[in-house]
């Protein structure tokens, strides 16, 4: 094993310089101190090395620090940062934004989204605020990262993020984080009026309550049916045939090809087969007349 | 995009001498490292000599340090090993590289040299 030799007479480098190109690799692991390559930084990135000689000086540093990289070496590790895991970052504490955004320039084109998420991520969970300037500097990097976050990290970006949010980039978030993005997106876009407002609102509106729903019925949104697919089934159940018309317009006649899927079948099986007949799109699968409907989810009523 | 290529390898007997040449395109004046490296079968690949375009500084390791030369015509954008007094020892392919941002970035595919005792 490359560890158990000793580094040999007079090869214990006191400084990163050109001699260590030429080092072989056990000898980089005898004689290479991680303290040391911790200082001088700087010159790891200037001076170029194998990746098979970075691998082993990663390998060094990990040593030296068990528990994590101090800040004080993040902020010096420039191109070094190419080489870290998003293990690895999770165990950082980082909170300076301009390390966050040094380290996000170098990540830039080189396939590290997983790493630059970890390393807002890691910034956030340290009280730090996501600002407009750290989303650009993200760059292409899809939002979807916003539904990694920890509900708590959430908290601190700032509402004005939203605006920046596509339609596909919440795809994949959970209910709690859908809600919590919903409210950002209500204050973020609170001096947008109409139709603006319901372009910019109807990507978040998978958080949406069902108070919400009835809401934005009363201003003739004409929602489309991916957006009203979108909608969580809770919210949605809640909702009558005559606020389900008023918020679908004309698009009410997209109903039928979804009445078998969910969430639009979740509806369906609330509510009355004749309020359904009414629409005359012959939608099935509500309530037979006559029915009475006990839901036993109200539990105070039993109480 | 970066692209090197190598020529001049060779079969050779111990003591005689060989010119590696390194035809870089695509380089752009930003990459300021260039290098040799060899690889014998077997063995780890080995810095052999580096050259700091900046100020032109070279750089060896011990094994080829007064028999190698490294150099580079930056106008022809071709970097140079001159290989001299060559020992069977150095037989291995030789590629070259451009070092850009603390990595060797851009590798040639390698020329092979062989020496014979």
């Known amino acids: 094993d490359a560890e158990q030799k000793a580094c040999p007479p007079g090869k214990e480098p006191y400084k990163v310089d050109e001699d260590l190109i030429f080092y072989q690799n056990w000898e980089l692991e005898a004689c290479v101190d991680g303290t040391m390559l911790a200082r001088q930084m700087d010159l790891v990135n200037e001076i170029p090395f194998t990746y098979e000689q970075l691998s082993i000086f990663k390998h060094k540093l990990d040593k030296t620090y068990p528990q994590g990289y101090p800040e004080s070496l993040i902020q010096q590790l420039g191109h070094f940062f190419r080489y870290v895991s998003p293990e690895d970052i999770h165990q950082w504490n980082v909170t300076s934004p301009d390390t966050v955004k040094t380290l996000l320039k170098v990540s830039k084109g080189q396939k590290m989204n997983a790493q630059a998420i970890a390393l807002v991520a890691c910034y956030l969970r340290g009280g730090g605020q996501l600002d407009e300037d750290m989303v650009k500097a993200l760059g292409d990097i899809p939002l979807s990262y916003l539904c990694d976050f920890s509900p708590q990290d959430l908290h601190s970006v700032p509402s004005s993020v939203m605006w920046l949010v596509g339609p596909q980039d919440l795809d994949k978030c959970s209910q709690r984080h859908l809600g919590l993005l919903y409210q950002k997106a209500c204050s973020a876009f609170q001096n947008v009026s109409g139709l603006e407002y319901f372009e910019k609102i109807k990507t978040f509106l998978g958080g949406a309550s069902v108070k919400d729903l009835r809401a934005l019925s009363q201003h003739n949104v004409s929602m489309d049916i991916a957006t009203f697919k979108r909608l969580q089934v809770d919210s949605l159940v809640g909702l009558s045939v005559a606020e389900v018309q008023k918020l679908l317009g004309p698009n009410i006649v997209d109903l039928k090809t979804e009445e078998d899927k969910s969430p639009v079948r979740d509806w369906l099986f609330r509510q009355h087969q004749k309020d359904l007949d009414r629409l005359g799109l012959g939608l099935q699968g509500g309530i037979p007349n006559g029915y009475l409907v006990l839901d036993f989810n109200v539990r105070e009523a039993f109480s | 995009q970066v692209k090197l290529e190598e020529s001049g390898g060779g079969s050779v007997q111990a003591g005689g001498s060989l010119r590696l040449s390194c035809t870089t395109s695509?380089?752009?004046?930003?990459y300021k490292w260039m290098g040799w490296f060899r690889q014998a079968p077997g063995q780890e690949r080995e810095g052999?000599?580096?050259?700091?375009?900046?100020?032109?500084?070279?750089y060896y390791s011990d094994s080829v340090k007064g028999r190698f030369t490294i150099s580079r015509d930056n106008a022809k954008n071709m970097i140079y090993l001159d290989m001299t007094r060559l020992r069977p020892e150095d037989s291995a392919v030789y590629e070259c590289?451009?070092?850009?941002?603390?990595?060797?970035?851009?590798w040639g595919q390698g020329t092979q040299v062989t020496v014979s005792s």
């Open positions: 695509g380089y752009t004046n930003s």
């Open positions: 590289a451009i070092g850009h941002d603390g990595a060797w970035r851009y």
């Open positions: 052999v000599a580096v050259i700091y375009t900046g100020n032109d500084r070279t």
